[in-house]
Every structure is written in structure tokens, then in C-alpha cells.
């Protein structure tokens, strides 16, 4: 069964910088990745980035750079311009569209106890939705 994992990391040097890492553990060919915040894509979440395997990537503020880390995982760098650091309490969701499996989505957030430079534990987050 495919799984999607999500990790959110705060940069040790810049407390206003965050990186969201997402990956797909499964046998399918990935056709599109969508990253959103505030909830799942299409269910109250706001799109931050879309990554297409061939056509490239597109991101929207406050996302800074979306990139493929491997052929089955991506990372999204975020720049928090506000002093209140809303990212610390935000849920980030990643949806992987895969052939022939369909769509798989999972969400994660920065652990409340996170020190700068630390990340969420590297375990797959339960899948929220499979279309």
C-alpha cells in the first residue's frame, strides 16, 4: 500500500525559514505533487506549490523554492516574513497523484517542542485521503 510522509523543519540559522519535505513510498509513477497549507488541497487548504515531473515547478508566496529531492520526494522552502511566525502552528499537506494508484495525501506540522534545526520524527504520517 502506498504511503505519503511529511516532515516540517525549521532552519537552525534562520528562525523565519522552514522547509517542508514530502515523499511517496509506493510502486507508482508520480504524475503531480501538490503542497498546501491550512488543510488538504481542495478542503480548506491554500496551494503553496505544484510540481510536475516534466514541466517543472511553480510556487506561490510565502513558498520560496519547490524542488524534487529524489524521483519520489520533494522539498519546499518557505520564508516567513511576519514576526509572529505562523508556520510554527500550521499544517502542511502533500498530495501525490500517482499512476495507477490514484491520489494519496498526508499532512504534518512542526512539532510544538521543536528546537531550531530539529525536524518531525522521520515516520510516515497516516494517510488522510486516498482518491
Amino acid at each position: 500500500t502506498p504511503e505519503v510522509w511529511v516532515q516540517v523543519q525549521m532552519e537552525a540559522t534562520e528562525l523565519s525559514s522552514f522547509t517542508v519535505h514530502c515523499g511517496f513510498l509506493g510502486p507508482g509513477s508520480i504524475s503531480l505533487v501538490t503542497v498546501s497549507w491550512g488543510g488538504p488541497d481542495g478542503a480548506g487548504g491554500t496551494k503553496l506549490a505544484v510540481l510536475h515531473p516534466e514541466l517543472g515547478t511553480r510556487q506561490w508566496a510565502p513558498a520560496r523554492q519547490a524542488r524534487w529531492e529524489t524521483q519520489s520526494s520533494i522539498s519546499l522552502a518557505l520564508e516567513d516574513s511576519g514576526a509572529s511566525s505562523p508556520f510554527a502552528n500550521t499544517t502542511f499537506c502533500c498530495k501525490f497523484a500517482s499512476f495507477p494508484e490514484g491520489s494519496w495525501e498526508s499532512c504534518g506540522s512542526l512539532p510544538p517542542s521543536s528546537d531550531p534545526g530539529l525536524s518531525a520524527p522521520p515516520t510516515p504520517v497516516p494517510i488522510l485521503r486516498a482518491d
Epitope: W5, Q7, Q9, H21, G23, P27, G28, S29, I30, L51, P53, E54, L55, G56, T57, R67, W68, E69, T70, Q71, S72, S73, S75, S119, P122, P124
Partner: antibody, heavy 123, light 106 residues
Framework: QVQLVQSGAEVKKPGSSVKVSCKAS????????ISWVRQAPGQGLEWMGN????????NYAQKFQGRVTITADESTSTAYMELSSLRSEDTAVYYC????????????????WGQGTLVTVSS | DIQMTQSPSSLSASVGDRVTITCRAS??????LNWYQQKPGKAPKLLIY???SLQSGVPSRFSGSGSGTDFTLTISSLQPEDFATYYC????????FGGGTKVEIK
């Protein structure tokens, strides 16, 4: 330019485990995945799995699932591949390689490669 | 799993010959195909990535083509240092290598 240097040759008994290391130097280690590939004597190349050091999550080939563990230590820029329940068929040269890509597309390839570590399984 | 079938498994050729190696995937892999060269006792070396892009430092006599399921590596004029084993690799769903093609001196 990143260079990968692997640990030395090992001789192991059937049923035991082996842990091979791969140290990166001359470039960023955390953000690029490290893959492990093996090659039995006179045979072809076989991908075993990979890891993204910055998140510590590994992906494994189905054939090796449950028998191989890939880990990484960011502080020393070193990746490890541990293979358990060794049998004679596991005698091979084990290579680490960097999963290299453009970032903006999903194209990935292996470059550079480590020099290889010969693991011999014999009673 | 995606299977990669290379042909021929071995071939004999002379210096100056044009050599063609083919690789077939068991399902469509778009252009997620790489080619490597390996010499005895050495680690593989990347030649071509993304089906047709020449890796920096690799001589222009090497070229790659194809998409979907059928791919080709061509050496336009074989040189003495080209006698080696060549592998294709798909990178669409995880990674799989072809069985290899050994290019020997005729």
C-alpha cells in the same frame, strides 16, 4: 565536486550482518539522496535502496525489504547500508552513489559513485 | 517492478565502428532513462541522463535517444577506451538496471 569514499572489504559468515559506510566530501551531503547498488561477481547492477540524509527516510527495493537498513549521519556526512541474514548469494561489490538531478524535474541519475566495497560471504 | 531488457548482451566490434545498443522497458518510462559505462574492477560511470542528455566530460561520440519503452545508446566511432560493459537504468519508478551489454574487441 562531491566524492564518495567507502569502507574496506569484509568477509562474513552466513547468517551474520554487514554494515558498509560511504563518506561524502567536497559538497553538500544532506539534501541529495544516497543510493546503494550491488554487483555480484560477473553479474549486472542491482539497486537496493536510497536515503535522503536530511530527513532520514529510506526507500527500499522490494527484493531487499526487511533485510536491508540504510541510515545516514549528517554530522559526519556518512551513509550506511546494513544487510542482515547474509547468504552466499550476497557476495558482491556494494556501491554507494549520489542521486543527482536537476531539481525542477523528476529526472535523477547516479553520479558520482563510491569505489565499491567487496563483501564476501563464506563459511 | 519495471523490467529493463538490453540487447545484445554482448557484441564484437572494431575501432572506428558505429555501435548501437538497445534497451526496452516493460512499460512506458517517458524519458526517465540513463546510460552507464563500466570497466572491469571500476565503478560505473554516467554517460547519458534523461534519455539523451550527454553528461559533462563525456565524448560527443556517445549519444542517446528514445522515449516511452524503446531507447538506444549509439557510439558513432568506437575508440579503444570504449571497450567496456554498458548498462541502461530506468528512474521512473524507483530504479532498475538492464542486464548489460559487453562491447568486446573483434
Amino acid at each position: 565536486q562531491v566524492q564518495l569514499v567507502q569502507s574496506g572489504a569484509e568477509v562474513k559468515k552466513p547468517g551474520s550482518s554487514v554494515k558498509v559506510s560511504c563518506k561524502a566530501s567536497g559538497g553538500t551531503f544532506s539534501s541529495a539522496a544516497i543510493s546503494w547498488v550491488r554487483q555480484a561477481p560477473g553479474q549486472g547492477l542491482e539497486w537496493m535502496g536510497n536515503i535522503i540524509p536530511i530527513v532520514g527516510i529510506a526507500n527500499y527495493a522490494q527484493k531487499f525489504q526487511g533485510r536491508v537498513t540504510i541510515t545516514a549521519d549528517e554530522s559526519t556526512s556518512t551513509a550506511y547500508m546494513e544487510l542482515s541474514s547474509l547468504r552466499s548469494e550476497d557476495t558482491a561489490v556494494y556501491y554507494c552513489a549520489r542521486d543527482t538531478g536537476r531539481g525542477y524535474t523528476r529526472h535523477f541519475w547516479f553520479d558520482p559513485w563510491g569505489q565499491g566495497t567487496l563483501v564476501t560471504v563464506s563459511s | 517492478d519495471i523490467q529493463m531488457t538490453q540487447s545484445p548482451s554482448s557484441l564484437s566490434a572494431s575501432v572506428g565502428d558505429r555501435v548501437t545498443i538497445t534497451c526496452r522497458a516493460s512499460q512506458s518510462i517517458s524519458s526517465y532513462l540513463n546510460w552507464y559505462q563500466q570497466k572491469p574492477g571500476k565503478a560505473p560511470k554516467l554517460l547519458i541522463y534523461a534519455a539523451s542528455s550527454l553528461q559533462s566530460g563525456v565524448p560527443s561520440r556517445f549519444s542517446g535517444s528514445g522515449s516511452g519503452t524503446d531507447f538506444t545508446l549509439t557510439i558513432s566511432s568506437l575508440q579503444p577506451e570504449d571497450f567496456a560493459t554498458y548498462y541502461c537504468q530506468q528512474s521512473d519508478i524507483l530504479y532498475t538496471f538492464g542486464g548489460g551489454t559487453k562491447v568486446e574487441i573483434k
